[in-house]
C-alpha cells in the first residue's frame, strides 16, 4: 500500500546476465542434388552475443550462405530483379534491396532466369525461409542467471536480487521459488503465455520485468524483487511488416589464400530486462 509519510525515490539498477546450456543441431542443407546432414554442438559462445544495455540475445535459428567470396555474380532473382537485356542494369547502381553494386550487365542466374550482375560477396544470399522447426529449438531448456544490483542513493541503500542463502541449482518458479534468479527460457515464455517453439523460428523480443517495491523503514523493512514476463515484439507475424527478430553476421576465413566468409542470418530471442520500482523511507 502507498505510505504517504514516506519519501520515495526511483530505483537505480545494473544488470548482468549469464546464459548456460548446450544444443545439438542437425542441419539439413540441400544444394546441387546433395542433401548434407551436419551434426554440431552449440555452446554459449556459439548462440549468445554481447548486447549493450540490459539485454541478451539467444540464437534459436539460422540460415547460412557458405563460401562467399568478393567477385562478380548474378544477383538473387527476387521479385522485380530479373532482366532480359543490359539496358535494365545500370553500372554503379546500388539498389537498397540488392547485395552489391551493378556492373551494367544482364547475366544468366540459372537456366530460366537472368538478373543484373553485381560486384558483391558471391554467390549472393538466397531469400530462404527460416527452417521450421527451429534448429536450436532445444534452447527452451537453456537457463539464464540474472544478477541485479540496485541502489537508492537518497536513502543510502544498496541490495541485490541474489541472496547469500540462495541455492545455485534452483530454478525460478512463480509459486515454489519466486526469489530464484535462475530462469529456464521455456518457463519465461510459458509465464508470458507464449509458445517458445513457435517464436524460436522467426525470433522475437521478450521482456523480463523486475519490480522492486521497497519499504526501507527499519520497523517494517522489505526489499525483494518481483519478476514478471511479457512479449515485447509484434506477435502477429503475418501482419507485421518484418516479422520476428534477426540480424546477419559473418565468419571470415582463408581458403587457398582467398578470403571467404560464411554469412549467417541469425534468428533468436532478445531478452530485455526492465528494472523499475521505488524505495520508500520515513
Amino acid at each position: 500500500s502507498d505510505k504517504l509519510y514516506q519519501r520515495k525515490e526511483p530505483v537505480i539498477s545494473s544488470v548482468h546476465t549469464k546464459v548456460k546450456g548446450i544444443a545439438e543441431v542437425t542441419e539439413n542443407v540441400t544444394e546441387g542434388g546433395v542433401t548434407k546432414l551436419g551434426h554440431s554442438i552449440f555452446d554459449t559462445a556459439d548462440y549468445t552475443f554481447p548486447l549493450q544495455g540490459n539485454s541478451f540475445f539467444v540464437m534459436t535459428n539460422y540460415v547460412k550462405s557458405e563460401g562467399q567470396v568478393q567477385t562478380l555474380c548474378p544477383e538473387y532473382p527476387r521479385r522485380g530483379a530479373q532482366c532480359s537485356s543490359d539496358r535494365r542494369c545500370k553500372k554503379g547502381w546500388m539498389d537498397p534491396q540488392s547485395k552489391g553494386i551493378q556492373t551494367g550487365r544482364c547475366v544468366p542466374y540459372d537456366k530460366t532466369r537472368k538478373t543484373c550482375e553485381v560486384s558483391a560477396w558471391c554467390p549472393t544470399e538466397e531469400e530462404k525461409e527460416a527452417p521450421r522447426p527451429a534448429l536450436l529449438r532445444s534452447a527452451e531448456n537453456f537457463t539464464v542467471l540474472i544478477k541485479n544490483n540496485i541502489h537508492f542513493p537518497g536513502h543510502n541503500y544498496t541490495t541485490r536480487n541474489i541472496l547469500p542463502t540462495m541455492n545455485g541449482s534452483c530454478t525460478f518458479h512463480k509459486t515454489w521459488d519466486p526469489q530464484c534468479s535462475i530462469f529456464r527460457l521455456g518457463d519465461i515464455f510459458q509465464e508470458a503465455g507464449e509458445n517458445f517453439t513457435e517464436v524460436a523460428v522467426q525470433g522475437g523480443i521478450m521482456g523480463i520485468e523486475i519490480y522492486w517495491d521497497c519499504n526501507l523503514d527499519s520497523w517494517s523493512h522489505h526489499c525483494r524483487p518481483r519478476y514478471s514476463f511479457r512479449r515485447l515484439d509484434d506477435k502477429n507475424t503475418d501482419e507485421s511488416f518484418v516479422p520476428g527478430y534477426n540480424f546477419r553476421y559473418a565468419k571470415y576465413y582463408k581458403e587457398n589464400n582467398v578470403e571467404k566468409r560464411t554469412l549467417i542470418k541469425a534468428f533468436g530471442i532478445r531478452f530485455d530486462i526492465l528494472v523499475f520500482g521505488t524505495g520508500g523511507k520515513f
Epitope: 546441387g32 546433395v34 542433401t35 548434407k36
Partner: nanobody, 128 residues
Framework: EVQLVESGGGLVQTGGSLRLSCAAS????????IAWFRQAPGKEREGVSI???????FYADSVKDRFSITADGAKTTVFLQMNSLKPEDTAIYYC??????????????????????WGQGTQVTVSS
C-alpha cells in the same frame, strides 16, 4: 534417354592407382549430382564419392584423401581417381546420377527423390 557407361576398372596391386571414367548422356551434369557407389562380394552397396551439380565434392570416410572425383570441361564425363588402393577397395564400382545424402562421412541415395540412374558397373580388384 539417360545413360551412364563406366570404364577404367581392372586389376591393380596394393598401393597402386586406377582412374575410373563415367560417360554420361541424355542429361547434363547441371541436372543431377553424380556419385560413385561400390559393392564388394557379400557386402552392401556403399557410397564412395559425390560430385554435386554445382561442383562440390563429398567423400566417404573410408576413401577420404585417397580418392578424387572430377568432371571434364564439357561436363559429360566424370572421373574417379583412386590412389593408395587397398584390398578392401575391391568391388564393382557403379556410376549413379541422382540425388544423394551426405551424413558425417557416409553417402547414400536420397530415395525420397527417386532411385537414380545407374550404370552397369566396372570391376576393380586390388591384390595384396
Amino acid at each position: 534417354e539417360v545413360q551412364l557407361v563406366e570404364s577404367g576398372g581392372g586389376l591393380v596391386q596394393t598401393g597402386g592407382s586406377l582412374r575410373l571414367s563415367c560417360a554420361a548422356s541424355g542429361f547434363t551434369l547441371d541436372d543431377y549430382a553424380i556419385a560413385w557407389f561400390r559393392q564388394a562380394p557379400g557386402k552392401e552397396r556403399e557410397g564412395v564419392s559425390i560430385l554435386s551439380s554445382i561442383g562440390k565434392t563429398f567423400y566417404a570416410d573410408s576413401v577420404k584423401d585417397r580418392f578424387s572425383i572430377t568432371a571434364d570441361g564439357a561436363k559429360t564425363t566424370v572421373f574417379l581417381q583412386m590412389n593408395s588402393l587397398k584390398p578392401e577397395d575391391t568391388a564393382i564400382y557403379y556410376c549413379v546420377a541422382g540425388h544423394f545424402v551426405y551424413n558425417d562421412g557416409a553417402i547414400s541415395l536420397n530415395t525420397a527423390r527417386g532411385s537414380g540412374f545407374w550404370g552397369q558397373g566396372t570391376q576393380v580388384t586390388v591384390s595384396s
